[in-house]
């Protein structure tokens, strides 16, 4: 047999469905099995209650990605193996990674007091996450437009040059990735 469609790397959120594709050709028609980190993957063919289904095409469908604080049964490196009595074919490796966004910010912004006309800097480091979270800022719950020439956002820093009285307010840093969003503790600019 030969593999005609190989699985691809995937990043997926906990609880979401996903599919690892695999298609094989051969005479006689090969059977397909999946292995994760070298260990055979149990599917609905082994246990009807399984959250993993072996589709007729040979693809592996996850009804929902199972992922705990410690137990991570779905995360790992997968291959599909096509077999018939003439031999076997092994697909390329595909990694299944589970997206993550923790709650706790590595660095919350802190209150800043600044004189009018002076620059102000607010700093934030988003929670740990995978993919690595990006950030944006909100002032008084409204997203800040960083296209304004006095405002620049670089890394975790919000820089306001030539501050005005109207810049005073509550600033929140928002960390975001495919999992969702997390708000930092607010910081007051006075």
């Amino acid at each position: 047999p030969r593999i005609v469609e190989h699985p691809s790397d995937v990043i997926v959120s906990k609880g979401e469905p996903t599919t690892l594709n695999c298609k094989a050709e051969g005479r006689p028609t090969p059977t397909i099995e999946w292995y994760k980190d070298g260990e055979r993957v149990e599917t609905d063919k082994d246990d009807p209650r399984s959250h993993r289904m072996l589709l007729p095409s040979g693809s592996l469908f996850f009804l929902r990605i199972v992922h705990g604080r410690r137990s991570k049964p779905d995360e790992g490196s997968y291959v599909c193996v096509a077999r018939n009595y003439l031999g076997e074919a092994v697909s390329r490796n595909a990694s299944l990674e589970v997206a993550l966004l923790r709650d706790d910010f590595r660095q919350n912004p802190t209150d800043v007091v600044v004189a009018a006309g002076e620059p102000a800097i607010l700093e934030c480091q988003p929670p740990r996450g995978h993919p690595e979270p990006t950030i944006y800022w909100k002032k008084d719950k409204v997203r800040i437009d960083d296209k304004e020439e006095r405002i620049s956002i670089r890394g975790g820093k919000l820089m306001i040059s030539n501050t005005r009285k109207s810049d005073a307010g509550m600033y929140t840093c928002v960390g975001t990735n495919m999992v969702g969003e997390r708000d930092s503790d607010p910081a007051e600019l006075t």
Epitope: K36, V66, G68, R69, R70, S71, K72, P73
Partner: antibody, heavy 118, light 105 residues
């Protein structure tokens, strides 16, 4: 069928050691942490620690550190719990339990009665 | 260490009664709280995980609520097979409550 099957009852003398086994089947052994929980006669449940079958990492509460050892053999999908320097108050039913991806013990072994008596 | 305090330690009830068991954590555990049922001579059985999610195959008369430090297991209409001991367990760092024995009145 997903199940955990434990070794049989043991009778030990104070000061001896006991090794209880837990054979896992029907699921990917290395994907789920394995915990050990014990229950003295007429008492509640007491957590003893966990092992990550993927790499052998372990964690125990302070009470059991230095006296409990948890190991695994991935080739036969079996986890082991070894308790040394046994005392009479170690008399209990010992359970292995799989920690699910929902952070709960969804599958339990049938239990192994360990009696420590002189 | 996080200490889990369950109350009451025992209760008597009749078939059809609504039964409530509470569990309090010594510090916040978010929703990392599970409930188990144990019958004499048997291993515990998972009923509720993550404070309020019903484990597959468990009857809907069982429900869980709470977050932070205070949690509740409710049996809406007690059935003969529900007479057992119930344990809460926090999976933040792992420890069990002392158990609640539900007996026939």
């Amino acid at each position: 069928e997903v199940q955990l099957v434990q070794s049989g009852a043991e009778v030990k003398k104070p000061g001896a050691s006991v090794k209880v086994s837990c054979k896992a089947s029907g699921y990917t052994f290395t994907g789920y942490y394995m915990h050990w929980v014990r229950q003295a006669p007429g008492q509640g449940l007491e957590w003893m620690g966990w092992i990550n079958p993927k790499n052998g990492d372990t964690e125990f509460p302070q009470k059991f550190q230095g006296r409990v050892t948890m190991t695994r053999d991935t080739s036969i999908t079996t986890a082991y719990m070894d308790l040394s320097r046994l005392r009479s108050d170690d008399t209990a039913v010992y359970y292995c339990a799989r920690e699910s991806g929902d952070d709960a013990f969804d599958i339990w072994g049938q239990g192994t009665m360990v009696t420590v008596s002189s | 260490d996080i200490v889990m305090t369950q109350s009451p330690s025992s209760l008597s009830a009749s078939v059809g009664d609504r039964v409530t068991i509470t569990c309090r954590a010594s510090q916040s555990i978010s929703s990392y709280l599970n409930w188990y049922q144990q019958k004499p001579g048997k291993a515990p059985k998972l009923l509720i995980y993550a404070a309020s999610s019903l484990q597959s195959g468990v009857p809907s008369r069982f429900s869980g609520s709470g977050s932070g430090t205070d949690f509740t297991l409710t049996i809406s209409s007690l059935q003969p097979e529900d007479f057992a001991t119930y344990y809460c367990q926090q999976s933040y760092s792992t420890s069990f409550g002392g158990g609640t024995k539900v007996e026939i009145k």
